[in-house]
């Protein structure tokens, strides 16, 4: 089973948000298929997405085993209709991915404001804790469970009648802010990992939520 006319994959790219992690590559296959292998720096190669005609492979199940490890993947190219044969000694063409450390490199997903409650001149704003596919003792962990105090949220809040955005920060999922009585406010949150020094340290902003709509409660 030769590998003539197979083209090595290229542009191997990790796409990862809240630890959901997919390896993508090119080219779209013509008369060839791919198999992906992944390993930690010190570990054995594990094969995934066997003989696929796709140009992506979901590697979440592997990387969530230890999100602080550094992973390397490689994509092998085989002729279409390839069947594994024990007698084959010729190594198919393959390409290595960049290294990927999930804890440092996964993008932060768009957060969601779960609720807000006004009591007098204070408003408590709660950010929804997103679940991830990372497990500990057979239990799925939330983003806060994984990142702990490394994850903070920035709250932007403003009077509905104004444009200037005040800010508050928390390393829990709750904010308690002072507001002017009788004013309606709008809120948006952003997840941040300050210890990161790369472009993925901030999430996109949550959808804006405003007082006077269904997510909020008001009590005197």
């Amino acid at each position: 089973s030769g590998t003539t006319n197979t083209v090595a994959a290229y542009n191997l790219t990790w796409k990862s948000t809240n630890f959901k992690t997919i390896l993508e590559w090119e080219p779209k296959p013509i008369n060839q298929v791919y198999t992906v292998q992944i390993s930690t720096k010190s570990g054995d190669w594990k094969s995934k997405c066997f003989y696929t005609a796709d140009t992506e492979c979901d590697l979440t199940d592997e990387i969530v085993k230890d999100v602080k490890q550094t992973y390397l993947a490689r994509v092998f190219s085989y002729p279409a209709g390839h069947v594994e044969s024990t007698g084959s000694t010729e190594e198919p063409p393959y390409e290595n991915s960049p290294e990927f450390t999930p804890y440092l490199e996964t993008n932060l997903g768009q957060p969601t404001i779960q609720s807000f409650e006004q009591v007098g001149t204070k408003v408590n704003v709660t950010v929804q804790d997103e679940w991830t596919l990372v497990r500990r003792n057979d239990t799925f962990l939330s983003l806060r469970d994984v990142f702990g105090k490394d994850l903070i949220y920035t709250l932007y809040y403003w009077k509905s009648s104004s444009s200037g955005k005040k800010t508050a920060k928390t390393n829990t999922n709750e904010f308690l802010i002072d507001v002017d009585k009788g004013e309606n406010y709008c809120f948006s949150v952003q997840a941040v990992i300050p210890s990161r020094r790369t472009a993925n340290r901030k999430s996109t902003d949550s959808p804006v939520e405003c007082m006077g709509h269904e997510k909020g409660e008001s009590r005197e």
Epitope: A199, R201, D205
Partner: antibody, heavy 121, light 107 residues
Framework: EVQLVESGGGLVQPGGSLRLSCAAS????????IHWVRQAPGKGLEWVGY????????YYADSVKGRFTISADTSKNTAYLQMNSLRAEDTAVYYC??????????????WGQGTLVTVSS | DIQMTQSPSSLSASVGDRVTITCRAS??????VAWYQQKPGKAPKLLIY???FLYSGVPSRFSGSRSGTDFTLTISSLQPEDFATYYC?????????FGQGTKVEIK
């Protein structure tokens, strides 16, 4: 090396306009927050306003609200301070500064060299 | 807005002296206070962040502490290059506010 370089200062008449630039290098402004601070001759530091370049959100000191506008162009890695309806009391050295967080506590670790704005007839 | 009341506004000291500058916040600001040093004609430089953490590259003779809403910058042994103006700043709420500054002069 992280650097902030302001430009655009100068002499302007009362009621006039000026646009200051804050060109960043060594980091991506969209990953941080940019503040403008001014210092009148012989006086202390006065905060002017901030921008989060990743979403364009801004907030201004009452003394400049409605007259000054902060913007950012992430493709140029540059923040701007547009100053309109200038008054004599706006005369100051204007600094831009990069804000970062240590957990939830903010600090301004890099500052530009400052650019002098003089409002006088 | 939160007021940061800094004292003294100026002080005279000699090389080797221990110098203390204080700032009082008008309300709780947790640890969200930074200290900056500014020399004439230059931009401010960060010394202390989060009330008590020494910024990278800053000499260890500088230290910061907090007691409730009172914040202190201490220079344990004043050096010739330390003669400058020092500012505290809170960024617990928007807008961030500075103290009035303390000018440290040579006695």
């Amino acid at each position: 090396e992280v650097q902030l370089v302001e430009s655009g200062g100068g002499l302007v008449q009362p009621g006039g306009s000026l646009r200051l630039s804050c060109a960043a290098s060594g980091f991506t402004i969209g990953s941080y927050w940019i503040h403008w601070v001014r210092q009148a001759p012989g006086k202390g530091l006065e905060w002017v306003g901030y921008i989060d370049p990743s979403n364009g959100y801004t907030y201004y000191a009452d003394s400049v609200k409605g007259r000054f506008t902060i913007s950012a162009d992430t493709s140029k890695n540059t923040a701007y301070l547009q100053m309109n309806s200038l008054r004599a009391e706006d005369t100051a050295v204007y600094y831009c500064a990069r804000a970062d967080y240590y957990y939830v506590d903010e600090y301004w670790d890099y500052w530009g060299q400052g650019t002098l704005v003089t409002v006088s007839s | 807005d939160i007021q940061m009341t800094q004292s003294p506004s100026s002080l005279s000291a000699s090389v080797g002296d221990r110098v203390t500058i204080t700032c009082r916040a008008s309300q709780d600001v947790n640890t969200a206070v930074a200290w900056y040093q500014q020399k004439p004609g230059k931009a401010p430089k960060l010394l202390i962040y989060s009330a008590s953490f020494l910024y990278s590259g800053v000499p260890s003779r500088f230290s910061g502490s907090r007691s409730g809403t009172d914040f202190t910058l201490t220079i344990s042994s004043l050096q010739p290059e330390d003669f400058a103006t020092y500012y505290c700043q809170q960024h617990y709420t928007t807008p961030p506010t500075f103290g009035q500054g303390t000018k440290v002069e040579i006695k």
